[in-house]
Interface confidence: low
């Protein structure tokens, strides 16, 4: 997180730390699902059980956390690893339910009315242990409040090289300051961009940290997030089809998706 | 020549009547007869919320037949109140006995509730009654447990710490 501040206990109780090949994040849904970015878990597709999932902690390196393991990972069938970040969304089913408390609480999915809290200039909050402006992964969970950016403005910002045309799709939303300085960054991938629903006084996930400019916090560039509201049917179908309850272990973890595997020779620079 | 005929012996006997069947508490006898003799039978039916028990074994039905020696071929069963047994534990919740401590018999009421703050009840209101079929049943007729679903979107940023 660039230009952010330290989170306090209970501020982001849905925050999940995912350690696999790299540091990434996710957000707890219900008590046995984690919402994350497809690119954050794609490299571990051959061994879902290798995902080390931690929650209930503020400190990235602390040994005091609630551990969870993956039972299955569902990558959106429309995500193609070496062709941009459209449909950059995945669900991890945990093999046990976690106990909910003030430090571990799920994030809400957006209601139909949620778009009214996610208009241009509305403030969302991104959190994570990713790179800070000092160039290191944060030891303490950090967060930053950033406004939603007009979609056309964001599309235009990424129309010029080195970004390929059409990088920003309708399945994405952008957030950040035109002057730069406040952004998510590498290592924050998969974490939730959350908004306050002022009617219910509950926080909901509007975006998933996906990608952005080569230099985080760059002026005239913005953080790009998967637009969660576009994927509510996909999320609900998977959760209903594959069950709410954790199986309590046993069996090998699996990856489930309907994509064609391609040789991932080209490695993106992404958050 | 005089004709010869054999002896004709006429036997007459009175069949032993079986003792009059007294219905067990919370049960009734059918059919009701003035007396029950050889090969007569009766069945016992329990009132709603009671079940037939022979010793500790539940019976689907009970019929006794009057024997030649004037005894019934089966001992009288009991009509015992249906017991739904201890209710299942509710994950992330608790159960309270409403009718009385540990009372789990017919028409007993229990109330499930979820752990405050972090869980909310889904499916029904959590009130279950012990029904005649031996199952705890909700007011909606469900025999499955309610669900304690985690409350989402709570944060110390809006509640000022919990």
């Amino acid at each position: 997180i660039y230009g952010g501040q330290k989170a306090k206990p209970g501020d982001f109780p849905w925050q999940v730390l995912i350690l696999g090949g790299t540091t990434a994040a996710g957000a707890l849904l219900y008590d046995n699902w984690v919402l994350t970015a497809a690119h954050a878990v794609y490299e571990q597709k051959h061994d879902a059980s290798a995902l080390d999932i931690r929650m209930g902690t503020l400190k990235r390196l602390s040994p005091h956390y609630t551990q969870a393991w993956s039972e299955a990972v569902f990558i959106h069938e429309g995500y193609t690893h070496d062709a941009g970040f459209d449909n950059d969304i995945a669900l991890i089913k945990l093999n046990n339910k976690v106990v909910i408390n003030s430090n571990i609480t799920p994030i809400c999915l957006p209601r139909k009315e949620a778009e009214s809290f996610m208009r241009t200039d509305d403030i969302g909050t991104a959190s994570g242990w990713g790179l800070t402006q000092r160039g290191f992964l944060a030891r303490n969970l950090m967060y930053v409040d950033i406004p939603i950016v007009d979609h056309q403005k964001c599309t235009a910002a990424y129309e010029k090289p080195p970004y390929p045309r059409g990088s920003v799709t309708a399945n994405m939303l952008c957030a950040g300051l035109e002057s730069g300085g406040k952004d998510s960054c590498r290592g924050d991938s998969g974490g939730a961009l959350v908004f306050l629903d002022s009617e219910t006084e509950r926080w909901f996930v509007g975006g998933i940290v996906s990608w952005g400019s080569m230099n985080c916090g760059e002026a005239g560039q913005y953080g790009v997030y998967t637009k969660v509201i576009n994927y509510i049917p996909w999320i609900e179908n998977i959760i209903s089809d594959f069950g709410g309850g954790g199986s309590g272990g046993g069996g090998s973890a699996k990856f489930v998706a309907a994509w064609t595997l391609k040789a991932a020779a080209h490695h993106h620079h992404h958050h | 020549m005089a004709s010869m005929t054999g002896w004709k012996i006429h036997y007459t006997s009175t069949a032993h009547a079986c003792p009059y069947p007294m219905a067990p508490p919370n049960g009734h006898v059918s059919p009701v007869q003035a007396k029950y003799i050889l090969k007569d039978s009766f069945s016992i039916f329990c009132e709603t919320g009671y079940e037939l028990l022979q010793g500790h074994l539940p019976l689907k039905s009970f019929t006794a037949v009057c024997q030649k020696d004037g005894s019934w071929d089966r001992p009288m069963p009991a009509c015992s109140i249906v017991d739904c047994g201890p209710p299942d534990d509710l994950p992330s919740g608790r159960v309270e006995y409403i009718t009385g401590p540990g009372v789990t018999t017919y028409k007993a009421v229990i109330q499930y509730s979820c752990e405050e703050t972090f869980y909310t009840m889904k499916v029904n209101d959590g009130k279950y009654v012990c029904e005649a079929d031996g199952f705890w049943t909700s007011s909606k007729g469900e025999k499955s447990l309610p669900v304690c679903e985690p409350v989402c979107g709570l944060s110390a940023r809006t509640t000022g710490g919990r």
Partner: antibody, heavy 125, light 107 residues
Framework: EVQLVESGGGLVQPGRSLSLSCAAS????????MAWVRQTPKKGLEWVAT????????YYRDSVKGRFTISRENAKSTLYLQMDSLRSEDTATYYC??????????????????WGQGVMVTVSS | NIVLTQSPATLSVTPGESVSLSCRAS??????IHWYQQRSNESPRLLIK???RSISGIPSRFSGSGSGTDFTLSINRVESEDFSIYYC?????????FGAGTKLELR
């Protein structure tokens, strides 16, 4: 390099007390839960007690509850085990260990990553 | 208490052989089993955590498997430094318990 050095062992009579210390170095002591584990030829390895990283909670095996007290001084990176009302069955080699935490289905769980060299405690008249 | 039974008590092998050591729990412990090696006159050393998860610095010839009640520690091509006692430990119950150990000795 992680180092755990126990001290304070020796011969003591039944009913008496003994205090063990464990000096830790090579890691951030106040980030780790700590434990004592003992070993005898007859009973093998036995977990004795655990203290959380900040000293807020302690856990004991049933046979030592009320007699043993585990404590820590984070400023000195030192772990202690105060053993009172000692019994002959407490005779063992006592190891100091770091314990990594894990929570599952609401239960506290752990394994022992680093161990000291051990200190011998003999309870005999 | 959860009882862990290790078998065999002693295993005689020659270097280069591959071996499997068994640990059986008296009730299901999910994957909450950890394996330790204790060389003669040394402290125990963590080899495998949570049934199959490797520990950095431990040679890759050590691997673990199993869940529920039956667990196995495998050593692929035993080396001379592997002749030790091996213990399993469960952390499913808050009263941690260890197995009695399997001694791996030179045939």
């Amino acid at each position: 390099e992680v180092q755990l050095v126990e001290s304070g062992g020796g011969l003591v009579q039944p009913g008496r007390s003994l205090s063990l210390s464990c000096a830790a170095s090579g890691f951030t002591f106040n980030d780790y839960n700590m434990a004592w584990v003992r070993q005898t030829p007859k009973k093998g390895l036995e977990w004795v007690a655990t203290i959380l990283f900040d000293g807020s909670r302690t856990y004991y095996r049933d046979s030592v509850k009320g007699r043993f007290t585990i404590s820590r001084e984070n400023a000195k990176s030192t772990l202690y085990l105060q053993m009172d009302s000692l019994r002959s069955e407490d005779t063992a080699t006592y190891y100091c260990s770091t314990e990594s935490p894990y929570y599952s289905e609401g239960y506290y769980q752990g394994y022992f990553d680093y161990w000291g060299q051990g200190v011998m405690v003999t309870v005999s008249s | 208490n959860i009882v862990l039974t290790q078998s065999p008590a002693t295993l005689s092998v020659t270097p280069g052989e591959s071996v499997s050591l068994s640990c059986r729990a008296s009730q299901s412990v999910s994957t909450s089993i950890h394996w330790y090696q204790q060389r003669s006159n040394e402290s125990p050393r963590l080899l495998i955590k949570y049934a199959s998860r490797s520990i950095s610095g431990i040679p890759s010839r050590f691997s673990g498997s199993g869940s529920g009640t039956d667990f196995t520690l495998s050593i692929n091509r035993v080396e001379s430094e592997d002749f030790s006692i091996y213990y399993c430990q469960q952390s499913y119950s808050s009263l941690y318990t260890f197995g009695a150990g399997t001694k791996l000795e030179l045939r």
